[in-house]
Interface confidence: low
Amino acid sequence: PEPPTACREKQYLINSQCCSLCQPGQKLVSDCTEFTETECLPCGESEFLDTWNRETHCHQHKYCDPNLGLRVQQKGTSETDTICTCEEGWHCTSEACESCVLHRSCSPGFGVKQIATGVSDTICEPCPVGFFSNVSSAFEKCHPWTSCETKDLVVQQAGTNKTDVVCGPQDRLRA
């Protein structure tokens, strides 16, 4: 019979013959022959392979470097890589999360619209009319201006997006 030119799923072609791939979590030790099956071995302690493969070496688990602000989110197994995330107050610079940067603070005049997470930065929004923020903060929202009327006071100085209104006593009418 003609030697196969294409192999079934989870097989590979070598020396004109189809050999079984190694399953996830195992590496190739020797190809199959006419008389023997593919020989595979489990990956070591800090190694993994996440696909059916013919790799002769397993990949090293990712190292979550604390010097880069990283910590382990999920420990790797023989079939999965370690997943890193950032320490509190930091977020990943990329989807692969290879390093972290400090969460952005919203400047005065801006408030937090969405709190930062391990993978996304703070989202700021300008304080609308009637609201202000006088601090640079990674989690404070815009605060509403003080209502002078409810305190039986009048506005002495208008508020801005960065400052609250200043209230003062009402002028008494002189007789």
Epitope: E88, G89, Q114, I115, V135, A138, F139
Partner: antibody, heavy 117, light 107 residues
Framework: QVHLQQSGAELVRPGTSVKVSCKAS????????IEWVKQRPGQGLEWIGV????????NYNEKFNDKATLTADKSSSTAYMQLSSLTSDDSAVYFC??????????WGQGTLVTVSA | DIVMTQSQKFMSTSVGDRVSVTCKAS??????VTWYQQKPGQSPKALIY???YRYSGVPDRFTGSGSGTDFTLTISNVQSEDLADYFC?????????FGAGTKLELK
Amino acid sequence: QVHLQQSGAELVRPGTSVKVSCKASGYAFTNYLIEWVKQRPGQGLEWIGVINPGSGGTNYNEKFNDKATLTADKSSSTAYMQLSSLTSDDSAVYFCARLDGGAAASWGQGTLVTVSA
Amino acid sequence: DIVMTQSQKFMSTSVGDRVSVTCKASQNVGTYVTWYQQKPGQSPKALIYSASYRYSGVPDRFTGSGSGTDFTLTISNVQSEDLADYFCQQYNSYPLTFGAGTKLELK
């Protein structure tokens, strides 16, 4: 070992205030946010707000803007929540919890506040 | 505010069963969801964070799944100690919000 120790139960009169404390140990107090959560008897959990003990910055659930004031004392690694103008609706168990990236993995044991004449 | 809806207030189960507690967010929260277990007279205990990651020490019969707006906590091979209230919480944006809770009870 992270531990949050809350102050004991309080029986208070309507219209008064109460201050609940949450003493943290086993970690760097200023490195994690502390949140406060309300639970009325037999009810669900209600988020009050959060404080950054390092900066004193806060974020409140608008519902509690005029009810709760969150503060923190770095020197004693203690977070506080003051509840003012108390009514029977404020009778509840109040929890403090440490936020780890947004999720509360460590909780205090809870403080029961009972408002009664 | 983001509303987290746990449509089933009570769920009946038997020891050894598999049960799924669901939670629906009123808007996309990515995977920023935590599941908590609470037993009477105790503080809530975090089981799952980022929708699907188990906290250390949590038995592997607890599994979280979902993203966007639909989330599920599955307990396979329910044990008597799993009878408790289960709450979901989103931490995608302020104010953080909880579901109303689902009480798991024996049939």
